[in-house]
Structure formats: structure tokens, C-alpha cells
């Protein structure tokens, strides 16, 4: 089974201990490493952080003791805009321009490959994001062919049915991709007023969603139903959390709220919590598991948070296993308590590496 | 591994000339440019143009103005064919490979003096 | 069209000193930039790609770093082999950029 792991460029900057660069992670515990994320510049791909040149280096090194990591670097992200890509994919000499720019800047900085994070493909860009991806393999396969190992192509996809339907054609973009990560997770929102886990396994009775969509179980037979083979889809585990502040006395599922959580004392930002942090809320607050959904919530005060915890992410693992995916993809390995410091294990990734674990597991 | 001009001479005003470029030594790659800068008599480098040796497409310098082309002869040659010639494009001219513009020229050749005057 | 603006034209220094070469890009162009050295009589030699990467067997003396649009070149313990023109290039070859060069600094070592 894969294991595919993102890596932050901008976890760099957390204070203290929740700062992570890439000579911290663990070079045995995934078998590809993604690099998040690169710029596109001028229709050229190109580095986004002053010191990304020193960051892959960093990354690219821990493969010197582990020959059979596989790393790649991904373009685009939430920040870089949909429309950016927009313009880059539909102008034909751009994304000419754009695909020829990729091979060597990889091949220089020595990654394995490219993973697309174009977040997201509107209903017009549906087609472009398909040419796209069709002639960056095209150029990966010439690039490949005076005996180099041939570039992989991989893309992270949403796992909402809404976006599937407009952006993607899963059928046609699944022949040229090695792998498809799915985002299995960010289902559940500020935006609709009240609790909910952000990354359900299943539907379950407690689902308080006003659809039936919102969920791992759905997204990742959706998928399959529209024709991505199951031996390259991978499938999102997010190593964080997403909170909400309580608008009244109710705790449960579905209780009102009044805006996201408050900030964590590293990740800054509301409505959000890296595991590590989660470790930290979890003391004095009260745990609950979510048991048609198979992962668990803990409340505290006024503060609720939805999170995956190394009993759910085995149930996780399990159902990818049933149902003959390529893996797992974990968002993110510095939102793991990557210095093993925060949970009381004594372990370094301790989600990742129950991930791992399961995914080893007979 | 080694890159060389030829062709280059004395010309007249207003005449035309073909400089070529022969590359040897160099194991088959797929993309790669070979490009022309040219240097006058005590000035800087400029940048005339490039050609990618995997889909034969061409960038030109915006002063060029359709004056020179730049096209592949065969696998390891490549010419820049130059036309309408003054005195102001007197210079030496070298051809220069790179895989890509992100990794600059790494191979270069001695250069071939081009004069123009009548 | 882009245009690379080299300063300074001509810069002093003493054996074992240090020299700082700017170049000015009109325009952003990332992380595409190169730095090549030229002798009398002789082809430039590239020296750093992609702004600050190294060409095999260059000297680690030489660094190259960026601030947004501007691009610097610092060569430190001034050998007399130093002594030469250094140009900067950009490394975007389409027609709306073209890889245009930087006029170019001198360097004597003293």
C-alpha cells in the first residue's frame, strides 16, 4: 500500500515547537513525501518560500537512507487561486510553457514527480484541467525516454460531490495519473451552523448534514462508480481537526454554534487544530466517539472539535483495505505530533504511524 | 562534450549569412535548447534566440523582428540564418546549450566572428 | 520587454576582499535567473543557476541570493582568477521575456 504524506512549507514558521522543517520527518514512515507547495510564475513552475531551494534539499536528502521514498512537489494550493490556473490551463501556449518548465526544475531539485493542487477546477475548467493532465504525462513519458526513471503525476482531488461533478472527468484524468488523492475530509464547515466531524468514515445516524454526501464511505465509492480504478485512488486522513465555539449549553452532534474555534497556540488559525494541539485540548475535556461515523469528538467549555485520533484512522485503513484502494494520504505530516512531545506516547507521528501500522497489518 | 559555430565572415550590407552550430559528445536527451547570443566587438552578451531541440519550437529576443530564424538541420546541427545584416549587428557569435532556461547555458562555443561593412 | 539593469558597471577589490554584483529584473521572473563569468577572449562560463544553485565545479566562494525582483552575486575571498565580466541572464526563453542579459560588471582584483 502507498502511504502519501504532505509536507507544509509553511509549518516553517510556527513558533516554537510547532515549527517543522523537513529534516524532521521520519524518512521510513511514508513512502511518498509531497512538498506543498510550488508557485507557478509566469507560466513557469518555480519555488514559492525564500528558502524552498534549502527545504528540498532538506527532503530530498532523506532518500539517501531510504532508496525507496519517493518524493514529490506539489503546485498550487488554496493560496495560489483557482483562477491562476484558470488562465494557465485554458491558454494553450501557457500551459505549454507551464508543462515544459516542470521536468527540469524536478529533475534539479530531485523530486520524483508533480502532484497537481489545482483547488479547484471550475465547471469550465473541467476540460482544460483533463488536457493538462493528459500533456503533462505526455511530457513526462518523452522526458523519460533516454533511460531516466519516468517523472510520476499525481493529483489531489475534493471529495465533495458538488466539485467531483463540475470539475473533474474522473474517468479520463484516472488513465494518466499513478495516483489520485482524495480530501477525504474538510466535509463539514463553520458555514452550516452547527457541530459536525469534518472527516466521517460513514454517513451515520448522528449525521445532522442536509446531505448524504458528506462523507469518506460516499466519496470514495463515488469515485469508483464514476470510473477511477481503485488501485490508484488514495485516501485523505487528516492529521488535524476542525473546531467550533458552542452557541448554547448542547454538545452533541449537530449542537449550534457560533463561529469556528478559537486559534491554536501554533497553527493560529480559527476553526483549526494540528493533532499535536488537539493532545493538549484533550486534557480536562470530554471525549466522545461518534459511533455510525467511527471517529470521535471531545468537547471543552465552549469549545468543540472534530478530529481523527489512532482508533479511527485504523478504521479508516480498514475500509480502504476492503475496499482494495492504493493507500492512504495524510494532510499533514507537520499537524502530526511530529516531535512525539505533545500526546504522552513517546512516539514521533504517532497518527501516521498507526496508519502505517494498520496499513502493514494482515 | 562540446558545442562550435562555423560560418561566420565578412558580409556586406543589406546581405544575409548562415551561421551553424554542431553539437558532439552529448548522450540523447529528449528537450533541450540550443541558442544564439551574440556579443559586439567590446560591448555586452545579448540574446538572439533559442530553439527546443524536443518539439522544434523557437523564441526570439523582440529586436530580432523576423531578421534571423533559427531552425534544426538535422539531430546535433542547428543554424541561424540572418538577413537585411548592418553594421550594428557586426559581433561574435556563439551558440549555447541548456536543458532548460531554469538551468542556464552550460555549454558554450568559442564563437564565430560575423562583419559586417562593405 | 524585460529588462536587466547590472550594477555596478565596474567594481575594485582587494585579493581576499569580497564583491557584491546586483542585478535588477523589470519584471518578476522568479527564480529563472543565472550568473555566468567572461575572459578576454574566451566563451562566459556559467556559474549559478536557478538563482542560487551552484554549477558543477564552481567555487563555493561565489552565493547567489534574491529579494524580490532583485538578484545578488557575491563573490568572498577575491582570488586573482576572479578578475573577469560577470552577467546575469534571465531564464524565461519565450518571446515576451527573451533571455535577456544584464550589461554586465567588470572586476578587477587588486
Known amino acids: 500500500y502507498k502511504l502519501v504524506c504532505y509536507y507544509t512549507s509553511w509549518s516553517q514558521y510556527r513558533e516554537g515547537d510547532g515549527s517543522c522543517f523537513p529534516d524532521a520527518l521520519d524518512r521510513f514512515l511514508c513512502t511518498h513525501i509531497i512538498y506543498s507547495f510550488a508557485n507557478i510564475s509566469n507560466d513557469h513552475i518555480d519555488t514559492w518560500e525564500w528558502n524552498d531551494v534549502t527545504l528540498y534539499g532538506m527532503l530530498n536528502t532523506l532518500k539517501n537512507r531510504n532508496p525507496n521514498l519517493k518524493t514529490l512537489l506539489s503546485v498550487g494550493g488554496w493560496n495560489f487561486g483557482s483562477q491562476r490556473f484558470s488562465k494557465i490551463a485554458s491558454n494553450t501556449q501557457s500551459r505549454r510553457t507551464f508543462i515544459k518548465s516542470v521536468p527540469p526544475f524536478l529533475r534539479t531539485h530531485g523530486f520524483d514527480g508533480l502532484d497537481l493542487a489545482w483547488l479547484y477546477p471550475g465547471r469550465r475548467d473541467k476540460q482544460h484541467f483533463t488536457t493538462l493532465i493528459k500533456e503533462m504525462k505526455a511530457e513526462f513519458i518523452k522526458e523519460a525516454q533516454p533511460g531516466k526513471k519516468q517523472l510520476l503525476l499525481s493529483a489531489a482531488l475534493s471529495a465533495g460531490k458538488v466539485t467531483i461533478d463540475s470539475s473533474y472527468d474522473i474517468a479520463k484524468i484516472s488513465q494518466h495519473l499513478d495516483f489520485i488523492s482524495i480530501m477525504t475530509y474538510d466535509f463539514h464547515g463553520a458555514w452550516r451552523g452547527t457541530t459536525g466531524h469534518h472527516s466521517p468514515l460513514f454517513r451515520g445516524q448522528e449525521d445532522a448534514s442536509p446531505d448524504r454526501f458528506s462523507n469518506t464511505d460516499y466519496a470514495v465509492g463515488y469515485m469508483l462508480r464514476l470510473g477511477a480504478p481503485a488501485s490508484k485512488l488514495v485516501m485523505g486522513i487528516p492529521t488535524f481537526g476542525r473546531s467550533f465555539t458552542l452557541a448554547s449549553s448542547e454538545t452533541g452532534v449537530g449542537a449550534p454554534i457560533s463561529g469556528p474555534g478559537i486559534p491554536g497556540r501554533f497553527t493560529k488559525e480559527a476553526g483549526t487544530l494540528a493533532y499535536y494541539e488537539i493532545c493538549d485540548f484533550l486534557r480536562g475535556a470530554t471525549v466522545h466517539r461518534i459511533l455510525g461515523q467511527q471517529v470521535p469528538y471531545a468537547t471543552k467549555g465552549n469549545q468543540w472539535v472534530g478530529y481523527d485520533d489512532q482508533e479511527s484512522v485504523k478504521s479508516k485503513v480498514q475500509y480502504l483495505k476492503d475496499r482494495q484502494l492504493a493507500g492512504a494520504m495524510v494532510w499533514a505530516l507537520d499537524l502530526d505530533d511530529f516531535q512525539g512531545s505533545f500526546c504522552g506516547q513517546d512516539l514521533r507521528f504517532p497518527l501516521t504511524n498507526a496508519i502505517k501500522d494498520a496499513l502493514a497489518a494482515t | 562534450q562540446s558545442v562550435e559555430e562555423s560560418g561566420g565572415g565578412l558580409v556586406k550590407p543589406e546581405g544575409s549569412l548562415t551561421l551553424t552550430c554542431t553539437a558532439s559528445?552529448?548522450?540523447?536527451?529528449?528537450?533541450?535548447?540550443m541558442c544564439w547570443v551574440r556579443q559586439a566587438p567590446g560591448k555586452g552578451l545579448e540574446w538572439i534566440g533559442c530553439?527546443?531541440?524536443?518539439?522544434?519550437?523557437t523564441y526570439y529576443a523582440s529586436w530580432v523582428n523576423g531578421r534571423f530564424t533559427i531552425s534544426k538541420a538535422s539531430s546535433t546541427t542547428v543554424t541561424l540564418q540572418m538577413t537585411s545584416l548592418t553594421a550594428a549587428d557586426t559581433a561574435t557569435y556563439f551558440c549555447a546549450r541548456g536543458s532548460s532556461g531554469y538551468n542556464g547555458f552550460n555549454f558554450w562555443g568559442p564563437g564565430t566572428l560575423v562583419t559586417v561593412s562593405s | 520587454a524585460l529588462v536587466m539593469t547590472q550594477t555596478p558597471a565596474s567594481v575594485s577589490a582587494a585579493v581576499a576582499g569580497t564583491v557584491t554584483i546586483k542585478c535588477q529584473a523589470s519584471?518578476?521572473?522568479?527564480?529563472?535567473l543565472a550568473w555566468y563569468q567572461q575572459k578576454p577572449g574566451q566563451p562566459p562560463k556559467l556559474l549559478i543557476y536557478?538563482?542560487?544553485i551552484l554549477a558543477s565545479g564552481v567555487s563555493s566562494r561565489l552565493k547567489g541570493s534574491r529579494s524580490g525582483t532583485e538578484y545578488t552575486l557575491t563573490i568572498s575571498d577575491l582570488e586573482c582568477a576572479d578578475a573577469a565580466t560577470y552577467y546575469c541572464?534571465?531564464?524565461?526563453?519565450?518571446?515576451?521575456?527573451?533571455?535577456?542579459f544584464g550589461g554586465g560588471t567588470e572586476v578587477v582584483v587588486k
Open positions: 559528445g552529448f548522450s540523447f536527451s529528449y528537450r533541450y535548447y
Open positions: 536557478a538563482t542560487s
Open positions: 541572464q534571465c531564464g524565461y526563453y519565450d518571446s515576451n521575456y527573451g533571455g535577456a
Open positions: 530553439i527546443d531541440n524536443g518539439d522544434g519550437d
Open positions: 519584471q518578476s521572473i522568479g527564480s529563472y
